[in-house]
């Protein structure tokens, strides 16, 4: 058993049929010694008396809010949550496995630049009685500070018969050094509580590996005289790190016909312009990637040829 | 050339070679070994790699003030990785194919380090750890980790040389 926060405790249980469970001793937070009784949740049934209460926690029915009273007065509460371990593996019932980039990916994180700011998100099908708490640091043995906001519901989607809820959180490294080569990864820890079930999820990454620039901006076409060719130009996204002579991007320009089956013409360039042939009903798209480190490409910015 | 006296390196040449290094480092990894990377665990060999840290002057402002600190750090890193790529981690079994990009990567590391420090000039080189031969079964995982680490190192070096070529070239 360990304390998650004041008056909230997590009991770690090996979860299998007829498991013995954990013996837990609760102590009433009071100077009083006599006449103390204990109840669980809304029940008025007295579970025991005295300053301490010993219980055997085996299942969710044994978890909940234990309250000690004297007379009609509430003295203190202890909320017990359960953390299940099945076959040596902690349960992951609350969050959905996003399976990208690999199986057992529950948290996904992205950064738009090297400033030390990043966003993480996760998915669940649970709509109520759900709370999240997020902590983060750079490194684990001698952690350096990363400040995370509160997790918020950022999207709702319908998937088949059930709804899926996306939560996200923004974090900022306290003393970011954008130009340095990271040697210690960022650690992100999410505590998830659904009713009386506790679970924790972690992710470890370097900012460089989660970079995904915003799409290029101000994408424009300029027809070239007496030619089917056009000059495409664009600019670095506003959110990208500066100076651009240091934090350089590379770009992919694609000409795509109306039909998905049509052959795509692609050009790669480090410049912010390119000359391509504009076919009728086609569109021109440009996306960006860090020039020197192969992290994610941005989403496409597109304009029609016509 | 970045000689200890403090004259300027051939920024444009260094930019071109460092960008090539980035490409090679990504094409060399993931190396197709003979098996999956099943053997996990941190290996000492990759814990000692030199990193370009915050105080090394490799940020745009630091380069403007005095690029020598940063160039010396990059030089140390290039020599370190060049030694690693020549060690039995890469020369031993499972053998790399003759056309593996690791050979080119190795040569390019040497080439850039020589551009930064021509014959006859000597910067203090960081102590290269005496690489005790790796157990053969550790080599695939070590290659994987070293190349991942090298990708990050050469990315910062390439940014430095790109910025230098754009803003510090005579």
């Amino acid at each position: 058993i360990w304390e998650l926060k004041k008056d909230v405790y997590v009991v770690e249980l090996d979860w299998y049929p007829d498991a013995p469970g954990e013996m837990v001793v609760l102590t009433c937070d009071t100077p009083e010694e006599d006449g103390i009784t204990w109840t669980l949740d809304q029940s008025s049934e007295v579970l025991g008396s005295g300053k301490t209460l010993t219980i055997q926690v085996k299942e969710f029915g044994d978890a909940g809010q234990y309250t000690c009273h004297k007379g009609g007065e509430v003295l203190s509460h202890s909320l017990l949550l359960l953390h299940k371990k099945e076959d040596g593996i902690w349960s992951t019932d609350i969050l959905k496995d996003q399976k990208e980039p690999k199986n057992k990916t529950f948290l996904r994180c992205e950064a738009k630049n090297y400033s030390g700011r990043f966003t993480c998100w996760w998915l669940t099908t649970i709509s109520t009685d759900l709370t999240f708490s997020v902590k983060s640091s750079r490194g684990s043995s001698d952690p350096q500070g990363v400040t995370c906001g509160a997790a918020t519901l950022s999207a709702e989607r319908v998937r088949g018969d059930n709804k899926e809820y996306e939560y996200s959180v923004e974090c900022q490294e306290d003393s970011a050094c954008p130009a340095a080569e990271e040697s210690l990864p960022i650690e992100v820890m999410v505590d998830a509580v659904h009713k009386l079930k506790y679970e924790n999820y972690t992710s470890s990454f370097f900012i460089r590996d989660i970079i995904k620039p915003d799409p290029p901006k101000n994408l424009q076409l300029k027809p070239l005289k007496n030619s089917r060719q056009v000059e495409v130009s664009w600019e670095y996204p506003d959110t990208w790190s500066t100076p651009h002579s240091y934090f350089s991007l590379t770009f992919c320009v694609q000409v795509q016909g109306k039909s998905k089956r049509e052959k795509k013409d692609r050009v790669f360039t480090d410049k912010t312009s390119a000359t391509v042939i504009c076919r009728k009903n086609a569109s021109i798209s440009v996306r960006a990637q860090d020039r020197y480190y192969s992290s994610s490409w941005s989403e496409w910015a597109s304009v029609p040829c016509s | 050339r970045a000689v200890p006296g403090g004259s300027s390196p051939a920024w444009t040449q260094c930019q071109q070679l460092s960008q090539k290094l980035c490409t090679l480092a990504w094409s060399a990894h993931p190396l197709v070994g003979h098996m999956d990377l099943r053997e996990e665990g941190d290996e000492e060999t990759t814990n000692d790699v030199p990193h370009i840290q915050c105080g090394d002057g490799c940020d745009p402002q630091g380069l403007r003030d005095n690029s020598q600190f940063c160039l010396q750090r990059i030089h140390q890193g290039l020599i370190f990785y060049e030694k690693l790529l020549g060690s039995d981690i890469f020369t031993g079994e499972p053998s790399l194919l003759p056309d593996s990009p690791v050979g080119q990567l190795h040569a390019s590391l040497l080439g850039l380090s020589q551009l930064l420090q021509p014959e006859g000039h000597h910067w203090e080189t960081q102590q290269i750890p005496s690489l005790s031969p790796s157990q053969p079964w550790q080599r695939l995982l070590l290659r994987f980790k070293i190349l991942r680490s090298l990708q990050a190192f050469v990315a910062v070096a390439a940014r430095v040389f790109a910025h230098g070529a754009a803003t510090l070239s005579p």
């Epitope: - | 098996m35 039995d88 031993g92 003759p98 690489l131 157990q135 053969p136």
Partner: antibody, heavy 115, light 107 residues
Framework: QVQLVQSGAEVVKPGASVKMSCKAS????????IHWVKQAPGQGLEWIGY????????KYNEKFKGRATLTSDKSTSTAYMELSSLRSEDTAVYYC????????WGQGTLVTVSS | EIVMTQSPATLSVSPGERVTLSCRAS??????LYWYQQKPGQAPRLLIK???QSISGIPARFSGSGSGSEFTLTISSVQSEDFAVFFC?????????FGGGTKVEIK
């Protein structure tokens, strides 16, 4: 094509030393290790050690440490093994080979230790 | 050190028969195992690398299997030129060690 060509047979007296060579051709000498293997008459194979021609790094079987010395010369793409304090049980064929998974073997050098 | 044990020591077979040679390591060596064939007066020749990977130029009748500490070399239909001594080798950790060999002879 790849070849490892070893020096000729040697007859040496007990207590003396012998130095044999292994010249590589047909591949980049510094790219792979050179292992040395002993095979006594009618017996199995025993690994002596290897050298990394790129950096002269060596690894020895404890059994041969101190008596076997491995060296190489990049300029001639040649690896060498010196065996000292020879005794009769050192009579054997000694093979050089590149990485195990490449199947580049020398033809062997027969060393006979006899008074 | 890892001890490699081969069995049987000698195998008498007729051409065309299927032959199975066994090699056991004293501890797990994953799939870092090599099989060699050696004929009198010749250097060993690599038949199989990493327990089951074939070598170009080696006839397809030679195949390897196993992982961990138990390994097998199979000759699907033994030919007259296959009679020789076969060695297995630990390529997993130092010192590299070889099995004592299995001699495959004509019945």
């Amino acid at each position: 094509q790849v070849q490892l060509v070893q020096s000729g047979a040697e007859v040496v007296k007990p207590g003396a030393s012998v130095k044999m060579s292994c010249k590589a051709s047909g591949y980049t000498f510094t790219r792979y290790l050179i292992h040395w293997v002993k095979q006594a008459p009618g017996q199995g194979l025993e690994w002596i050690g290897y050298i990394n021609p790129y950096n002269e790094g060596t690894k020895y079987n404890e059994k041969f440490k101190g008596r076997a010395t491995l060296t190489s010369d990049k300029s001639t793409s040649t690896a060498y093994m010196e065996l000292s304090s020879l005794r009769s049980e050192d009579t054997a064929v000694y093979y050089c080979t590149s990485n195990w998974d490449l199947d580049y073997w020398g033809q062997g050098t027969l060393v006979t230790v006899s008074s | 050190e890892i001890v490699m044990t081969q069995s049987p020591a000698t195998l008498s077979v007729s051409p065309g028969e299927r032959v199975t040679l066994s090699c056991r390591a004293s501890q797990s060596i994953s799939d870092y195992l090599y099989w060699y064939q050696q004929k009198p007066g010749q250097a060993p020749r690599l038949l199989i690398k990493f327990a089951s990977q074939s070598i170009s130029g080696i006839p397809a009748r030679f195949s390897g299997s196993g992982s961990g500490s138990e390994f097998t070399l199979t000759i699907s239909s033994v030919q007259s030129e296959d009679f020789a001594v076969f060695f297995c080798q630990n390529g997993h950790s130092f010192p590299f060690t070889f099995g004592g060999g299995t001699k495959v002879e004509i019945k």
